[in-house]
């Protein structure tokens, strides 16, 4: 009879996680008598996967009945495959003895496990930033195999190019993780914007996984301030309004100061949203001109989202005859409407982006 050969016809087999893997092995001869064993790996540390002779292998089933006469098919089926099952499997023929003696091994079959990546999780910066600043978003996905994977970033449907991606580990592993960091430049219109991390992998059959983050969690849009005086009322009261516009988020506190003394403090709440996601708020203050001998310096002080206060001041001119009805009381707006929000004094309050 010809010399025994142990044939493993497939060099490699790829199986999706959760499925069964069939590892084929045939012997070319019934001689010599002795069992087949399957191992993962080689050398002294190899792992016994199945032994025809003895042991309990709940996940392994021989494809052919081992008691079948003339049986030379020693293929096995491993159920419920996980990434941890990846490796090279060897079908090894033993010669009957006390103990049985290893005789010949097949060439090995490499089992690779196709495991889906987890849903990408996108996380943004810990603190908010203002327009024109660059913020970083991180996308993570885990547990996939094989290692090849594609990750793309989008902002409002437009693909981003400023990102860095790493797949770990660098060497062979049962499964892999990906981490990518994208840099996004904020604009004032980004309250409703979204960044999307898209992961494509062979296991997803062309249907990529997506993770999203809203820029509303990352952006701060500081308010514009404008203080104006309405026309003098018949009762010598001047209505001064402070218009706080285009800010986000809503968290805002407004304080009126009369000649440096706190007159009133208000908190913004339940404001209607602008189309772009920002908010507007108008606060007014009635000043009784007849109660003042000198000009009144009114300051609208706004503290937005825990940032340093921004001031806008306004002087109400009290005339020589303030109590005469119709007297031409003048009002002078001494504030600026620049985006840095420096106040009149500029020595106490600086706005930090």
């Amino acid at each position: 009879e010809e010399e025994l050969q142990v044939i493993q016809p497939e060099k490699s087999v790829s199986v999706a996680a959760g499925e069964s893997a069939t590892l084929n092995c045939t012997a070319t001869s019934l001689i010599p008598v002795g069992p087949i064993q399957w191992f993962r790996g080689v050398g002294p540390g190899r792992e016994l996967i199945y032994s025809q002779k003895e042991g309990h292998f709940p996940r392994v089933t021989p494809v052919s009945d081992p008691t079948k006469r003339n049986n030379m098919d020693f293929s096995i089926r491993i159920s419920n495959i996980t990434p941890a099952d990846a490796g090279t499997y060897y079908c090894v023929k033993f010669r009957k003895g006390s103990p049985d003696v290893e005789l010949k091994s097949g060439a090995g079959t490499e089992l690779s496990v196709r495991a889906k990546p987890s849903a990408p999780v996108v996380s943004g910066p810990a603190v908010r930033a203002t327009a024109e600043h660059t913020v970083s978003f991180t996308c993570e996905s885990h547990g996939f195999s094989p290692r090849d994977i594609t990750l793309k970033w989008f902002k409002n449907g437009n693909e981003l190019s400023d990102f860095q991606t790493n797949v770990d580990p660098a060497g062979k592993s049962v499964s892999y993780s990906i981490r990518s960091t994208a840099r996004v430049v904020l604009t004032r219109r980004d309250v409703h914007s979204q960044v999307i991390c898209e992961v494509a992998h062979v296991t997803l059959q062309g249907d990529p996984l997506r993770g999203t983050a809203n820029l509303s969690e990352a952006i701060r849009v500081p308010p514009f301030l404008e203080v104006t005086q309405q026309s003098m009322r018949a009762d010598n009261q001047v209505n001064v309004t402070c218009q706080v516009t285009k800010f986000y988020p809503q968290r805002l506190q407004l304080t009126w100061l009369e000649n440096g003394n706190v007159s009133r403090t208000e908190m913004a709440s339940a404001l209607p949203e602008n189309k772009d996601g920002t908010y507007n708020w108008t606060s007014w203050l009635l000043v009784n001109v007849s109660a003042h001998r000198d000009d009144v310096k009114l300051t609208c002080q706004v503290e937005h989202d825990g940032q340093p206060a921004v001031n806008k001041s306004f002087s109400v001119k009290v005339s020589a005859h303030p109590k005469e009805q119709g007297s031409n009381t003048a009002a002078e707006n001494t504030g600026t409407n620049e985006r840095d929000y420096k106040d009149d004094d500029d020595k106490h309050h600086h706005h930090h982006h």
């Epitope: 001689i31 008598v33 002795g34 025809q52 009945d65 009957k96």
Partner: antibody, heavy 119, light 110 residues
Framework: QVQLVQSGAEVKKPGASVKVSCKAS????????INWVRQAPGQGLEWIAM????????HYNQIFKDRATLTTDTSTSTAYMELRSLRSDDTAVYYC????????????WGRGTLVTVSS | DIVLTQSPDSLAVSLGERATINCRAS??????????IFWYQQKPGQPPKLLIY???NRDSGVPDRFSGSGSGTDFTLTISSLQAEDVAVYYC????????FGQGTKLEIK
């Protein structure tokens, strides 16, 4: 190490039944056939039957088909051979033997159980 | 059924000499490229021991003075140089169909 340990000697009266056991160890019981062979005093070997413990498939020698029954208990890795309607010429040593190569051969043998049928 | 006939029924051979036992089948026991013949040795008070399987293959631990040959219907067990411990009864068995044994050959020292 493969071991087949058989039950002890039996003395039976003609017409009775005997059930011989064979407890296997050192291998996966369900992966190999168990054969039963008998040998009358001073005589040759006579094959009785064989059983596949994995599914209880059996093959009988026509001579014993109506009187012998093979069973297994996989929970204890034990094979049994029952022989009914005993006659004096059933007096013999009964062996169980394991077929290690699935060649319908007998690789490992128990030490035998002497069954004596006498009135 | 296939019937196996061994010859001789008994045999006496001097120590160190060759012993030859024959087994003839009533029909061919060759199938699937193999000759389905097995040889056993049984010493007094012991169960049989497998010596040769598939006509010509020595079982594990069997001394190389034992050899098997033959094909189809005629088979031979040869002991090239008889040793004292080889005194026993030798049986052939086929498994071309369900197993049967030859009647046995008693080997003694001359």
């Amino acid at each position: 190490q493969v071991q087949l340990v058989q039950s002890g000697a039996e003395v039976k009266k003609p017409g009775a039944s005997v059930k011989v056991s064979c407890k296997a160890s050192g291998y996966t019981f369900t992966n190999y056939w168990i054969n039963w062979v008998r040998q009358a005093p001073g005589q040759g070997l006579e094959w009785i039957a064989m059983i596949d413990p994995s599914d209880s498939e059996t093959h009988y020698n026509q001579i014993f088909k109506d009187r012998a029954t093979l069973t297994t208990d996989t929970s204890t890795s034990t094979a049994y051979m029952e022989l009914r309607s005993l006659r004096s010429d059933d007096t013999a040593v009964y062996y169980c033997a394991m077929d290690y190569g699935s060649l319908y051969a007998m690789d490992y043998w128990g030490r035998g159980t002497l069954v004596t049928v006498s009135s | 059924d296939i019937v196996l006939t061994q010859s001789p029924d008994s045999l006496a051979v001097s120590l160190g000499e060759r012993a030859t036992i024959n087994c003839r089948a009533s029909q061919s026991v060759r199938s699937s490229g193999y000759n389905w013949i097995f040889w056993y040795q049984q010493k007094p008070g012991q169960p049989p021991k497998l010596l040769i399987y598939l006509a010509s293959n020595r079982d594990s631990g069997v001394p190389d003075r034992f050899s098997g040959s033959g094909s189809g219907t005629d088979f031979t067990l040869t002991i090239s140089s008889l040793q004292a411990e080889d005194v026993a009864v030798y049986y052939c068995q086929h498994s071309r169909e369900l197993p049967t044994f030859g009647q046995g050959t008693k080997l003694e020292i001359k």
